[in-house]
């Protein structure tokens, strides 16, 4: 007999608003395999069960986060495979302040990523870049996390802000700095970047 799950990963990241199908199938040497998903919240996707297979459709809602388990059996032999589903939100919605930097001033620059999920400092990281390198000497102030105002009911999204105190930008000043925000998920790294021009 063979037991297969497609995609085969034990952790799957799904962008909010996108759908994903996880197909669990099993074939038996004799007879028809029994395959089903368990550990499902009522809200976690929909299941279509066919002879020898079961398809879990995840709708890409934040409530779809969970760890369903596919169980397949041939007679007295059974196999199982769990899939940790993480639904994330990371739109390219970075806002920087100020809109431009003035050389020779002691200033604070902020970078806000809007409509984020999960709002976990371990998943989301901010960097202030000069070219492709972190800006040497910038001092990171404490990050802020606030709930976004939602038009509809549902699991809330967050905005996360990082501020830095800038070192002297030198002479001549660089044309721009960049705020880079990275979301690190299982087997997936996403990055957005926003320019902060420097007045010349």
């Amino acid at each position: 007999q063979s037991f297969q799950v497609n995609p085969p990963e034990s952790e799957v990241a799904v962008a909010m608003g996108t759908s994903l199908q996880i197909t669990c199938s099993m074939s038996c040497d004799e007879g028809v395999a029994r395959v089903h998903w368990r550990g499902l919240d009522t809200s976690l996707g929909s299941v279509q069960t066919l002879p020898g297979s079961s398809i879990l459709s995840v709708r890409g809602m934040l409530s779809d986060t969970g760890t369903p388990v596919c169980v397949g059996s041939c007679g007295s032999r059974s196999f199982q495979h769990s899939v940790k589903i993480l639904v994330y939100a990371f739109p390219d919605q970075l806002v920087v302040s100020p809109e431009f930097l003035v050389p020779g001033q002691d200033q604070v620059v902020s970078c806000t990523a809007h409509n984020i999920w999960p709002a976990d400092p371990n998943s989301l990281s901010f960097a202030l870049l000069l070219g492709e390198q972190r800006l040497e000497g910038a001092q990171a102030l404490e990050p802020e996390q606030e709930e976004e105002i939602q038009e509809a009911e549902g699991t809330p999204l967050f905005r996360m802000t990082q501020r830095w105190r800038l070192p002297s930008l030198g002479t001549p000043a660089p044309p721009a700095l960049h705020c880079q925000v990275t979301m690190q998920l299982p087997k997936l790294v996403l990055t957005h970047r926003k320019e902060i021009p420097v007045l010349q």
């Epitope: 002691d106 001092q139 102030l141």
Partner: antibody, heavy 119, light 107 residues
């Protein structure tokens, strides 16, 4: 000469309040971010709060958040720390310190003022 | 928060000795590290900033080195006035944090 001088320490009962002051002289006070750092008897240094030159940014260590408030009066060249709901573990010498623009280390410290919280 | 760990926590040395104190950060602080000296009943005094820059007025027998997570304060020839407690501090990100201190005592 650049100087910082703290005052306002003393003995206070648990749950009580105290306001510390730090008088600055010898530099343009409003140009500098300022800090409070404390040191419990026989212990190391613990940063507790900062305030930016224009008071637009403040922050606190978790150990004092919600109980202490930092403020400044640039016209008087004075930094303040309002301490409420004091606990025995707040007993310490409290120092104010200036931080260096563009570099951010604490380059000038006051002599400290002692706060004792005891019944 | 970034943890700063100093070693040793105390040491005994004689006048003229070369003394080395190390400081390790739990994550990279680049070169955003300062060293302070504190004598009993006194305020801390800045010795070194940006990991290796000597503060104005501090004797040249004090030097700092390192970057990232590992830093060293060296006193090339210990003088009687150097017996004190030394603290490292990272100011890369808030909350700024100090090492637990290294007490340098007379042997």
């Amino acid at each position: 000469e650049v100087q910082l001088l703290e005052s306002g320490g003393g003995l206070v009962q648990p749950g009580g309040s105290l306001r510390l002051s730090c008088a600055a002289s010898g530099f343009t006070f409003s140009d500098f971010w300022m800090h409070w750092v404390r040191q419990a008897p026989g212990k190391g240094l613990e940063w507790i709060s900062y305030i930016s030159g224009d008071s637009g940014y403040t922050n606190y260590a978790d150990s004092v958040k919600g109980r202490f408030t930092i403020s400044r009066d640039n016209s008087k060249n004075t930094l303040y720390l309002q301490m409420n709901s004091l606990r025995a573990e707040d007993t310490a010498v409290y120092y104010c310190a200036r931080d260096r623009p563009y570099y951010y280390y604490m380059d000038v410290w006051g002599k400290g003022t002692t706060v004792t919280v005891s019944s | 928060d970034i943890q700063m760990t100093q070693s040793p926590s105390s040491l005994s040395a004689s006048v003229g000795d070369r003394v080395t104190i190390t400081c390790r950060a739990s994550q990279s602080v680049s070169r955003s590290l300062a060293w302070y000296q504190q004598k009993p009943g006194k305020a801390p005094k800045l010795l070194i900033y940006a990991a290796s820059s000597l503060q104005s007025g501090v004797p040249s027998r004090f030097s700092g080195s390192g970057s990232g997570t590992d830093f060293t304060l060296t006193i090339s020839s210990l003088q009687p006035e150097d017996f004190a407690t030394y603290y490292c501090q990272q100011y890369k990100s808030y909350p700024v944090t100090f090492g637990q201190g290294t007490k340098v005592e007379i042997k």
